[in-house]
């Protein structure tokens, strides 16, 4: 029977700069029941606080709700593991909420084949930003990426859409069924997961010729 091994805070993520969650990996438990606590203070503060919510983010997590989240402050946090034989502490982690944003995937992905008489046919893709993100405030710039592939293909074709919420793709294989997905990322932060796939059947008469 031993004191617990050193835990590690390995990830902090925020969906929208308004709340965030951090997760830690326990070290070895020393063969004994081990209790974990996350303590933090904000840069410039002397008072330490303990995690306000160990439940929302699942096991080995700390969730900071709206009232505990400030964009303009760096959080300095540490996890303490304690059993009957002693304690061990993680390294301190410095967290700036601005840089840990990972949005939810974009919503309302719509895909349509457009075949104008006077121009080349194209695939028209449209989506909406994730609900939790308020783009009106100007705090966020979201960038988008689209990926698509024929249903049975192994490789994805990736297109960067910038800040647009719609995109046209010209070169497609007629008669194929395509999967289309979109994801987003803030200017500082992480790519969201890909949105659920939308399927589109490309007509056999879809021509790529001029």
């Amino acid at each position: 029977q031993l004191p617990p091994g050193k835990p590690e805070i390995f990830k902090c993520r925020s969906p929208n700069k308004e709340t965030f969650t951090c997760w830690w990996r326990p070290g070895t438990d020393g063969g004994l029941p081990t209790n974990y606590s996350l303590t933090y203070h904000r840069e410039g503060e002397t008072l330490m606080h303990e995690c306000p919510d160990y439940i929302t983010g699942g096991p080995n997590s700390c969730h900071f709700g709206k009232q505990y989240t400030s964009m303009w402050r760096t959080y300095i946090m540490m996890v303490n593991a304690t059993n009957q034989m002693g304690s061990s502490f993680s390294d301190e982690l410095y967290v700036d909420v601005t840089y840990i944003v990972q949005p939810d995937p974009p919503l309302e992905l719509a895909v349509e084949v457009k075949q104008p008489e006077d121009r080349k046919p194209y695939l028209w893709i449209k989506w909406s930003p994730p609900t939790l993100i308020d783009l009106k405030t100007g705090w966020f710039t979201l960038l988008y990426e689209i990926r698509l592939k024929p249903e049975k293909a192994a490789e994805w074709e990736i297109h960067f859409a910038g800040q647009q919420t719609e995109f046209k793709i010209l070169s497609l294989h007629p008669g194929q069924k395509y999967l289309v997905q979109v994801r987003c990322k803030p200017d500082h932060g992480y790519w969201s997961a890909w949105s659920p796939a939308t399927f589109i059947q490309i007509p056999s008469d879809f021509t790529m010729n001029d």
């Epitope: 303590t39 008072l47 439940i55």
Partner: antibody
Framework: EVQLVESGGGLVKPGGSLRLSCAAS????????MNWVRQAPGKGLEWVSS????????HYADSVKGRFTISRDNAKNSLYLQMNSLRDEDTAVYYC???????????WGQGTLVIVSS | DIQLTQSPSFLSASVGDRVTITCWAS??????LAWYQQKPGKAPKLLIY???TLQSGVPSRFSGSGSGTEFTLTISSLQPEDFATYFC?????????FGGGTKVEIK
């Protein structure tokens, strides 16, 4: 509606012990640090002790250190203050208060009176 | 320990008056200061936190300002229900401390 209800106060002789309780309802008790604050008759407020969400951070005023012990039971939504070696100067109304770490002591109980007298 | 000094200790005022209470900290506490109102036989009630943020449900005639070592609580137009004792509290470092209080009485 948030409610904090203290109990356990009463008359005790110097050197005696008392255990105060604070029952919380209408809040996610486990998400907040909790505090005891006291007020001697006709006097101001004095912070006594605080305890964090999972009891990993505990602090006491110098005047009670070594004599009082704060604890909590999140499963029972309850806060406690074990008071030993009581002195005349511990006579006061004892309040429990919720500490919203983003703000201050935003909810208080109605208080329980502790009288230490021979 | 950080000492908080409130001034004045007593204040006589009339309904409609503008009232200002000052709280000085013995060392800098940034904006980690709260103001409470207490009526006889009742628990304190939070009015202002982080020096200037009005607690939900508190009338807008109450306002707070200051940072560092000097803070003020202002009641823009005193109402009958505002006659009470007011305390400041620092939440910058342990031990958490309160000011001595300011009793606002009817003139």
């Amino acid at each position: 509606e948030v409610q904090l209800v203290e109990s356990g106060g009463g008359l005790v002789k110097p050197g005696g012990s008392l255990r105060l309780s604070c029952a919380a309802s209408g809040i996610t008790f486990s998400s907040y640090s909790m505090n005891w604050v006291r007020q001697a008759p006709g006097k101001g407020l004095e912070w006594v002790s605080s305890i964090s969400t999972r009891s990993s951070l505990i602090h006491y005023a110098d005047s009670v250190k070594g004599r009082f012990t704060i604890s909590r039971d999140n499963a029972k939504n309850s806060l406690y203050l074990q008071m030993n070696s009581l002195r005349d100067e511990d006579t006061a109304v004892y309040y429990c208060a919720r500490w919203d770490a983003a703000a201050a002591f935003d909810y208080w109980g109605q208080g329980t009176l502790v009288i230490v007298s021979s | 320990d950080i000492q908080l000094t409130q001034s004045p200790s007593f204040l006589s005022a009339s309904v409609g008056d503008r009232v200002t209470i000052t709280c000085w900290a013995s060392q800098g506490i940034s904006s980690y200061l709260a103001w409470y109102q207490q009526k006889p036989g009742k628990a304190p009630k939070l009015l202002i936190y982080v020096a200037s943020t009005l607690q939900s449900g508190v009338p807008s005639r109450f306002s707070g300002s200051g940072s560092g070592t000097e803070f003020t609580l202002t009641i823009s137009s005193l109402q009958p229900e505002d006659f009470a004792t007011y305390f400041c509290q620092q939440l910058n470092s342990y031990p958490l401390t309160f000011g001595g209080g300011t009793k606002v009485e009817i003139k």
